[in-house]
């Protein structure tokens, strides 16, 4: 039974005579007259078992004391700490040359834990131990025991255990405490890697390389290694582990981020507070959830605040110039907390009678500098139809607009393009031809570009070749041209007029009047 005594963490005690309750019962040779076990009071007035010998008056002393078998426990080098007290030879009257002030320390390796006898020749000498302090008989009365402490080491050891022996050659000495221990580098955590208890190497200069294992919730960055030095100290940490995402280093452990904090990657950083407009409701968050109405773009870092789509642009102004429109606006009041704002233009062509019936403008319309992804707050739109109702929407967008279920970030304006000269009339037909007249009809121009005020019909005899022509005006899309000569070829042109002016004449329609008083119905451009 041993009592508990506290020693350094890097020392593992194999034998401690001070912790043994009752007699030690070591083997002495000779059995009597040499070493004897004596109980004394220590400095705390506690009885301790000691071995003493004081055969100082007789020469040629050879008194041996051997410990019980001491297990090696895998240690290759062990340390022997001896606390002893020695009586000064000068305090013993007349002992002359017979008194010594040293003793010898030996060891013997053995797999046998029950050797009963001391065979001196089996033992290997470790050292001769001398005292730093000795005392005279008088000193004992002061209640201060003058202890010498000597430490020796021995190794490499290879058998299961060993015995220690103390040889007295004529000193007055007491072994107050014998402690045998080996050194280990104690279990430790360094750079988030755990290194196990490691017994030191066989040599006093050896280093034992030990690979560490990452603590819970961490991963290797570089292979963690350390060296266990002969003195039981860890040396030269190499490599390290990093706390996993959602965990940070606290007291040598990787502990989960607290609620309201997060850590996105395996780094040596600490958990960060959730960015603005986000939260975490569990420990160990690797990212924070955006508040309602806030979003995070795909390429946004977890450290960025959650943002929202911008509000609508402000102060949209339109400037119509015939079939072009210039639009300008101001930035939204709320950019949603983002810098990546841009603008998209949506163009809709709407009916005059019913503005709700709008259709996309199509590809014929051109936008300068561009229709989508505008970085400026103005755009020029060209190639519109004249005298047409258009609705233009300016959409403010940013990196999270696509996540927004409520499209409320646009401002719109409806404009009507100015009237322009109409386009040419595509098809003119001779509906009825007589000897003296031709009835014409035509379609409205493809692009009236305004309100058609009238149509102008220009005609002339073909052989006159426009040297002499006549004009007939009509608001309708048909007219009768009378007073023509029979059997004569005429060329007809039709054009439309709006408030902005005349359009181009149509392609010529050639018609020959009849010779007989009959009626010819024609629909070609060159009726004969």
């Amino acid at each position: 039974v041993t009592g508990s005594r506290v020693y350094p963490a890097n020392e593992v005690t194999l034998l401690d005579s001070r912790s043994v309750q009752g007699e030690l019962g070591w083997i002495a040779s000779p059995l009597e007259g040499g070493w004897e076990e004596v109980s004394i009071m220590d400095e705390k007035n506690t009885p301790i078992r000691t071995y003493q010998v004081c055969n100082v008056m007789e020469p040629s002393q050879n008194n041996w004391l051997r410990t019980d078998w001491i297990t090696r426990e895998g240690a290759q080098r062990v340390y022997i700490e001896i606390k002893f007290t020695l009586r000064d030879c000068n305090s013993l009257p007349g002992v002359m040359g017979t008194c010594k002030e040293t003793f010898n320390l030996y060891y013997y390796e053995s797999d046998n834990d029950k050797e009963r006898f001391i065979r001196e020749n089996q033992f290997v000498k470790i050292d001769t131990i001398a005292a730093d302090e000795s005392f005279t008989q008088v000193d004992i009365g002061d209640r201060i025991m003058k202890l010498n402490t000597e430490i020796r080491d021995v190794g490499p050891l290879s058998k299961k255990g060993f015995y220690l022996a103390f040889q007295d050659v004529g000193a007055c000495i007491a072994l107050v405490s014998v402690r045998v221990f080996y050194k280990k580098c104690p279990l430790t955590v360094r750079n988030l890697a755990q290194f196990p208890d490691t017994i030191t190497g066989a040599d006093t200069s050896s280093l034992v390389e030990v690979r560490g294992s990452c603590v819970n919730n961490s991963e290797e960055k570089d292979v963690p290694k350390m060296y266990c030095g002969a003195d039981g100290e860890w040396l030269v940490p190499i490599g390290n582990c990093l706390c996993n995402a959602g965990h940070e280093e606290r007291s040598g452990e990787c502990q989960a981020c607290k609620i309201g904090y997060y850590k996105a990657l395996s780094t040596d950083a600490t958990c960060a507070k959730c960015p603005p407009h986000s939260y975490s409701v569990w420990e160990g968050a690797t990212s924070c959830t955006c508040d309602r109405g806030f979003f995070r773009a795909d390429n946004d870092a977890a450290s960025m605040p959650c943002t929202r789509p911008p509000s609508a642009p402000l102060n949209l102004i339109s400037n119509v110039n015939e079939t072009s429109v210039n639009l300008e606006w101001s930035s939204p009041q709320n950019t949603g907390g983002r810098q990546d704002i841009s603008y998209n233009v949506v163009c809709k062509k709407c009916g005059a009678g019913d503005p709700s019936k709008c259709r996309p403008c199509g590809s014929g319309v051109h936008y300068t500098p561009q229709q989508n992804g505008l970085k400026t707050t103005k755009v020029s739109i060209t190639d519109l139809l004249a005298h047409t109702n258009y609705t233009f929407e300016i959409w403010a967008v940013n990196g999270v607009s696509k996540y927004n279920p409520n499209p409320d970030q646009s401002v719109s304006v409806t404009v009507t393009t100015n009237q322009a000269a109409p386009s040419s009339i595509a098809l003119v037909q001779a509906k009825e031809v007589t000897r003296y007249s031709v009835a014409l009809a035509w379609l409205e121009p493809d692009r009236p570009n305004g309100v058609i005020l009238e149509y102008e019909v220009k005609y002339y005899e073909k052989d006159q070749n426009e040297r002499s022509y006549r004009i007939v005006r009509t608001a309708a899309r048909n007219t009768d041209i009378k007073g023509l000569n029979p059997l004569t070829s005429y060329v007809f042109h039709v054009r439309a007029r709006t408030a902005a002016g005349y359009g181009d004449f149509s392609e010529p329609l050639e018609v020959t009047t009849n010779t007989v008083p009959s009626r010819i119905i024609g629909d070609g451009a060159n009726s004969t």
Partner: antibody, heavy 121, light 106 residues
Framework: QVQLLQSGAEVKKPGASVKVPCKAS????????MSWVRQAPGQGLEWMGW????????TYAQGFTGRFVFSLDTSVSTAYLQISSLKAEDTAVYYC??????????????WGQGTLVTVSS | EIVLTQSPATLSVSPGERATLSCRAS??????LPWYQQKPGQAPRLLIY???TRATGIPDRFSASGSGTDFTLTISRVEPEDFAVYYC????????FGQGTKVEIK
């Protein structure tokens, strides 16, 4: 077996001398000092001093100098206590005792049976 | 000179009882003082040395303790053969004995 053998009782007249022998056996005589202790009738023990059996060097306690002499004959492993000029108050049992010197101090571990010295006119 | 005073001078106990003997020094001495037992008509014999080491042949009902100036010899259960006079001794430069405590049958 370790033994200290003392002589029988002595009756002396005042002024005479007496030499009390103490023969040791069972151990090496010169390895331990020898101490002398007096015990007057009905009284306690009184330490007289000791002699180093190796060197013959004596140490006397206070009150036991002058008339008291410790001596040795190592050839026969015997220590002697000689008292001269005996007085009536010297009447006592005289013990020889082997001194056990230890690191922690000294004691007397083996005692002779004692010699009664009676001083009477 | 260091004076050792033992008390009581006489201790009356019945066999089987516990006996506690005191030894007080006039100044501090080593805690490892020896005790001796002397029966009538016999030489003293060493009882205890060191702090509490019993001499050869001494039964374990005898124990000793103390330090500084106060020391105690205890007989846990007195046996008939224990009735005797007990002396403490100190070993400074000059040795001295206590005057003794007589343990007698009650």
């Amino acid at each position: 077996q370790v033994q200290l053998l003392q002589s029988g009782a002595e009756v002396k007249k005042p002024g005479a001398s007496v030499k009390v022998p103490c023969k040791a056996s069972g151990y090496t005589f010169t390895s331990r000092a020898m101490s002398w202790v007096r015990q007057a009738p009905g009284q306690g023990l009184e330490w007289m001093g000791w002699i180093n059996t190796n060197t013959g060097n004596p140490t006397y306690a206070q009150g036991f100098t002058g008339r008291f002499v410790f001596s040795l004959d190592t050839s026969v492993s015997t220590a002697y206590l000689q008292i001269s000029s005996l007085k009536a108050e010297d009447t006592a049992v005289y013990y020889c005792a082997r001194v056990r010197t230890t690191v922690y101090g000294d004691n007397m571990d083996v005692w002779g049976q004692g010699t009664l010295v009676t001083v009477s006119s | 000179e260091i004076v050792l005073t033992q008390s009581p001078a006489t201790l009356s106990v019945s066999p089987g009882e516990r006996a506690t003997l005191s030894c007080r020094a006039s100044q501090s001495v080593s805690s490892n003082l020896p005790w001796y037992q002397q029966k009538p008509g016999q030489a003293p014999r060493l009882l205890i040395y060191g702090a509490s080491t019993r001499a050869t042949g001494i039964p374990d009902r005898f124990s000793a303790s103390g330090s500084g100036t106060d020391f105690t010899l205890t007989i846990s259960r007195v046996e008939p053969e224990d009735f005797a006079v007990y002396y403490c001794q100190q070993y400074g430069p000059s040795w001295t004995f206590g005057q003794g405590t007589k343990v007698e049958i009650k």
